[in-house]
């Protein structure tokens, strides 16, 4: 009688299961008591001798490529050996590498966690993932693992992390890069500083007073609100960052506390109050303002 080793599938892909069957045509194992054993090169596989003519291999890897055969032994100790079967495990090259971010969209708050997720649509076996910063490519980290995705983490993002990033994946068929992903670090506004600017040292009624509010840090656009005794005077926008000014034609009622607020959608900050007082100099007919 002949004995055959049948591998199904016969040309497995890395990571996929394979069933080895030790087949004796025209003879059911129930027709006679047989023990079966499967071998790779010179090593027995699985449980060794068993009454089952099948052996399940949960996942085949490139290093499992080799020469396989099986043996069947009757109760009378006669051993049949199959021909050797070469099983070549096929490695799928990496393809369609992409870089995604968490949070999505590449916008992250300063101090928050940023994760750069490198993924491949296809690829088997040990895949090496590498992350690079900048179009020139400063290597940040590399990881080798048997999965289609890998992560690089920046636990607390700084302003200097705002850059373009890309990743590369490779499993023995040459490197495959992702596209560039831009990271924007969103910075909440700092506490703004309010400055009062008058055309002269002693501003008079009907002079134009400039209220200048500026937050030294914060991602644009920044919206500034101006207040007199907590009553809104108006707002000004700074689309590219920096400060903004609000002009006021002075009257006697403009004495009191002034403040401003900066808001860029990531939080609002209020300035310290600046007090503006009218003073009446001796012998002068007109009122003057001092701050």
């Amino acid at each position: 009688a002949e004995l055959f080793l049948i591998a199904s599938p016969s040309h497995p892909t890395e990571g996929s299961p394979v069933t080895l069957t030790c087949k004796m045509p025209f003879l059911q194992s129930s027709d006679a008591q047989f023990q079966f054993c499967f071998f790779r090169d010179t090593r027995a596989l699985g449980p060794g001798w068993s009454s089952s003519p099948k052996l399940q291999i949960a996942a085949m890897w490139k290093e499992d490529t080799g020469s396989y055969w099986c043996e069947a032994q009757t109760m009378a100790s006669k051993v049949l050996r199959s021909r050797r079967s070469q099983i070549n495990v096929h490695r799928v090259p990496v393809a369609d590498v992409s870089l995604e971010t968490q949070p999505p969209g590449g916008q992250v708050m300063e101090g928050d966690r940023l994760v750069l997720i490198c993924s491949v649509a296809m690829g088997t076996g040990d895949i090496t993932f590498l992350w690079y910063k900048g179009a020139v490519g400063l290597n940040l980290q590399s990881k080798t693992q048997r999965s289609l995705t890998a992560e690089y983490e920046i636990p607390s993002v700084r302003e200097s992390d705002a850059e373009q990033y890309y990743c590369v994946a490779e499993n023995g068929y040459g490197p495959s890069p992702s596209g560039l992903v831009s990271i924007t670090v969103r910075i909440p506004v700092s506490r703004p500083i309010l400055m009062l600017r008058a055309p002269r040292a002693q501003a008079a009624v009907e002079d134009v007073l400039e209220l200048h509010c500026e937050a030294l840090r914060g991602s644009p656009p920044i919206l500034y609100w101006f207040y007199h005794e907590d009553i809104t005077l108006g707002s000004r926008s700074a689309p590219s960052g920096g400060g903004a000014s609000f002009n006021l034609s002075l009257t006697e009622e403009h004495s009191g506390n002034y403040s401003c607020e900066a808001n860029n959608g990531l939080g609002a900050q209020r300035s310290e109050a600046v007090t503006l007082n009218f003073t009446v100099p001796t012998g002068a007919r007109s009122n003057h303002l001092t701050s």
């Epitope: 009688a1 002949e2 055959f4 049948i6 069957t21 087949k23 045509p25 025209f26 003879l27 059911q28 194992s29 129930s30 027709d31 021909r83």
Partner: antibody, heavy 119, light 108 residues
């Protein structure tokens, strides 16, 4: 493309021996996973497996016909043959040769040849 | 010996309808070693399904096989005119290969 072709006399006298040959083209009969079999079909009836052979010469027969059947192989000619002795009218049938890997399902068949047993 | 019994003996249906052919074994078929063949008049049988449910090369996906143990089914989801023929099941799990007696699928 694998092809199998049966040949032999279409008429055999009762009690004599039926002899058929199957010529294989498009593949070697010595391919080490294939068995080569004979199947017959009486007119208007179903299919009956007669037996099979491996290129090494190992044979496997239907127990109901075993005492009258001999299947042999000639690897040099890429042929295998069937001999069925002591035929009767019940042996009148279309005889097919076919290939089956590991002795499993028949995936390639000849077109069949009708053998009539006359009394 | 595993005896295969096919039912019905004849099935009369119209094109476009669904056909269900049954093959029952007298004992469990080893490792699901069961195949289905189609035979048209004057032609050799043609392999359609093997290993219970795997379609042979070139067989349209309207043909499907299912079952295990002793009960097996060939289903033709939507009959085409060329599907009307005789269908045989075959088991190859032991020392004796056997065929069913066939189901004739005819146009109603």
């Amino acid at each position: 493309q694998l092809q199998l072709q049966e040949s032999g006399p279409g008429l055999v006298k009762a009690s004599e021996t039926l002899s058929l040959t199957c010529t294989v083209s498009g593949d070697s009969i010595s391919s080490n996973t294939f068995y080569w079999g004979w199947i017959r079909q009486p007119p208007g009836k179903g299919l009956e497996w007669i037996g099979s052979i491996y290129y090494s010469g190992s044979t496997y027969y239907n127990p109901s016909l075993k005492s009258r059947v001999t299947i042999s192989v000639d690897t040099s000619k890429n042929q295998f043959s069937l001999k069925l002795s002591s035929v009767t009218a019940a042996d009148t049938a279309v005889y097919y040769c076919a290939r089956h890997e590991y002795g499993d399902f028949f995936d390639y068949w000849g077109q069949g040849t009708l053998v009539t047993v006359s009394s | 010996e595993i005896v295969l019994t096919q039912s019905p003996g004849t099935l009369s249906l119209s094109p476009g309808e669904r056909a269900t052919l049954s093959c029952r074994a007298s004992q469990s078929v080893s490792s699901n070693y069961l195949a289905w063949f189609q035979q048209r008049p004057g032609q050799a049988p043609r392999l359609f399904i093997y290993g219970v449910s795997s379609r042979a090369t070139g067989i349209p996906d309207r043909f499907s096989g299912s079952g295990s143990g002793t009960d097996f089914t060939l289903t033709i989801s939507r009959l085409e005119p060329e599907d009307f023929a005789v269908y045989y099941c075959q088991q190859y799990g032991g020392s004796l290969i056997t065929f069913g007696q066939g189901t004739r699928l005819e146009i109603k």
